[in-house]
């Protein structure tokens, strides 16, 4: 066959669908690889061809569109399963071609099983809610295009295994689930089950997402440096190890990049010649506020090192702060036999 632009296996689009449920999968060529849409391609005389490779096989084979009840069908740039079966798992390829042009891409499709409480290997999207906010909503995801607007589906919401009814601050409102004054106890997996009729059959769509209640922007503050501070002096003798922790609290802020760094005499540690190491640890509160600790370490500190300026810096979307550590050379304790004796006038 003539040359074809092969975009390879698009593992970025690891598509997971539930067994025994409808699935509509758009050919990724038009969404991510080509600059024109399906309608334009079709008008230009290009044909979209689908084929697949079964799990643990190397052989590409055409998709059987002649199954009973049209279980697998194609509509424009969408491959339909009504419904999926476990052995539909594999790599699917869509190819757009005519006599002079060819472009194709493959993508993995995994059909997964779920238990009666909706647990499965499915990777779940995470929806963040702000703590104590008035009303926040999540929407049953990825159900567009499954049924026409004239069809009125029934939607049932679950938290974990339990149907949501008479939950105090969680209210089902059709495709939406409203949270009134969210608390951390609202954390968990929420599932919507959408049931709709089609050609005398009833189909179910199951969608689960994880809700995580996070710190509210109204409570957010600029970074707070807990250490170094004015109460602790790092007093060392030359040759000792100098350890200075920089501990910074960051309020949760959506999409904020939290940074902590040290400067020594105004320079980054990488830009100076002394042998310094920096170790970082990060911990999170239940509302995803973050505490970062960077420990600056000089194994054998010199007199010169003890005269330097060590400053901890922190930055978030809320602002930038800095704090200098108090470092000084320890005055050696007097040796009694010599110094004190001299002090008493002994010779």
């Amino acid at each position: 066959s003539e040359r074809c632009d092969d975009w390879g296996l698009d593992t970025m689009r690891q598509i997971q669908v539930f067994e025994d449920e409808p699935a509509r999968i758009k050919c990724p060529l038009f969404e991510h690889f080509l600059k024109f849409n399906y309608s334009t391609a079709h008008s230009a005389g290009l044909t979209l061809i689908w084929y697949w490779t079964r799990q643990d096989r190397d052989l590409e084979e055409p998709i059987n569109f002649r199954l009973p009840e049209n279980r697998i069908s194609k509509e424009k740039d969408v491959l339909w399963f009504r419904p999926t079966l476990l052995n539909d798992t594999g790599n699917y390829t869509c190819m757009l071609r005519n006599t002079t042009y060819c472009s194709k891409v493959a993508f993995p499709l995994e059909v997964v099983q779920k238990d009666s409480c909706f647990n499965s290997p499915m990777k779940l999207p995470v929806h963040k809610l702000y703590i104590e906010y008035g009303i926040q909503r999540i929407t049953c995801p990825n159900v567009d295009g499954y049924f026409p607007s004239s069809v009125k589906p029934t939607i049932t919401w679950y938290m974990g295994c339990y149907k949501i009814q008479n939950f105090n601050n969680v209210i089902p409102e059709g495709m939406n689930l409203s949270f009134l004054i969210a608390l951390i106890s609202n954390n968990g997996n929420y599932t919507c089950v959408v049931t709709y009729p089609e050609n005398g059959r009833t189909f179910h769509l199951t969608r689960t997402l994880t809700v995580k209640v996070v710190g509210s922007p109204k409570n957010a503050v600029p970074p707070v440096i807990h250490s170094p501070n004015d109460h602790v002096v790092y007093e060392k003798e030359p040759g000792e190890e100098l350890l200075i922790p920089c501990t910074v609290y960051f309020s949760f802020l959506m999409d904020s990049r939290n940074e902590v760094w040290w400067t020594i005499d105004g320079k980054k540690p990488d830009d100076i010649t002394i042998d310094v190491t920096i170790n970082e640890s990060i911990s999170h509160s239940r509302t995803e506020d973050e505490t970062r600790t960077q420990i600056l370490s000089i194994k054998k500190v010199t007199s010169e090192d003890l005269k330097r300026s060590y400053v901890c810096h922190a930055r978030s979307a809320k602002g930038e702060v800095a704090k200098a550590a108090k470092v000084k050379q320890k005055v050696p304790a007097p040796r009694y036999t010599v110094e004190l004796a001299c002090g008493f006038g002994a010779t």
Epitope: G134, N168, L180, I184, S185, K218, N219
Partner: antibody
């Protein structure tokens, strides 16, 4: 200094209505969820209602749902409780209380007495 | 709704002695539990939040412990001003609920 001052209590007949107010000062009122908590004579504390800092989210105890409405006016630093269809069992001292998830009900008003009696 | 049960209903203690008050939740409330003190004719006053953190201005003789379903308020050495009713309250789940109270009286 944080202060919460309730008003509007009094004697009302069963089936009647009353509107309680709570004037807040000494803090940024618009940043806090606010609540009403009540205490019947000689009894314990009962949470009645909560409202989010922006006034959008409201929650009620089952015992008052459909009869009481909580609201707030952040421009006036004032919290309200509209009480309709009052019953004898609503007789209590009503407190307004400031709430933040991290510190619970950290400040309370001195309370206002509502008596429902014929 | 989560039911909070306090024990004992009344605790008779001599000044200077230690008082231990218990609070049990009908299901886990994590560490989202507060303790309040109420004296006759006064509003409740926050003592402890987050099960173990003392509120601003509360003396060190008050301490809280526990998590999940079992919580304790300890007053290490009772002063005359500590004789009052103490309430626990969960703020983990709506509706927020209080215990029925423990009255600490002079023995």
């Amino acid at each position: 200094e944080v202060q919460l001052l309730e008003s509007g209590g009094g004697l009302v007949q069963p089936g009647g209505s009353l509107r309680l107010s709570c004037a807040a000062s000494g803090f940024t009122f618009a940043e806090y969820a606010m609540n009403w908590v009540r205490q019947a004579p000689g009894k314990g504390l009962e949470w009645v209602s909560a409202i989010s800092y922006d006034g959008e989210g409201t929650l009620y105890a089952d015992s008052v749902k459909g009869r009481f409405t909580i609201s707030r006016d952040n421009s006036k630093n004032t919290l309200y409780l509209q009480m309709n269809s009052l019953r004898a069992e609503d007789t209590a001292v009503y407190y307004c209380a400031r709430f933040r998830y991290y510190t619970a009900f950290d400040y309370w008003g001195q309370g206002t007495l509502v008596t429902v009696s014929s | 709704e989560i039911v909070m049960t306090q024990s004992p209903a009344t605790l008779s203690v001599s000044p200077g002695e230690r008082a231990t008050l218990s609070c049990r939740a009908s299901q886990s409330v994590s560490s989202n539990l507060a303790w309040y003190q109420q004296k006759p004719g006064q509003a409740p006053r926050l003592l402890i939040y987050g099960a173990s953190t003392r509120a601003t201005g509360i003396p060190a003789r008050f301490s809280g412990s526990g998590s999940g379903t079992e919580f304790t308020l300890t007053i290490s050495s009772l002063q005359s001003e500590d004789f009052a009713v103490y309430y626990c309250q969960q703020y983990n789940n709506w509706p927020w609920t209080f215990g029925q109270g423990t009255k600490v009286e002079i023995k």
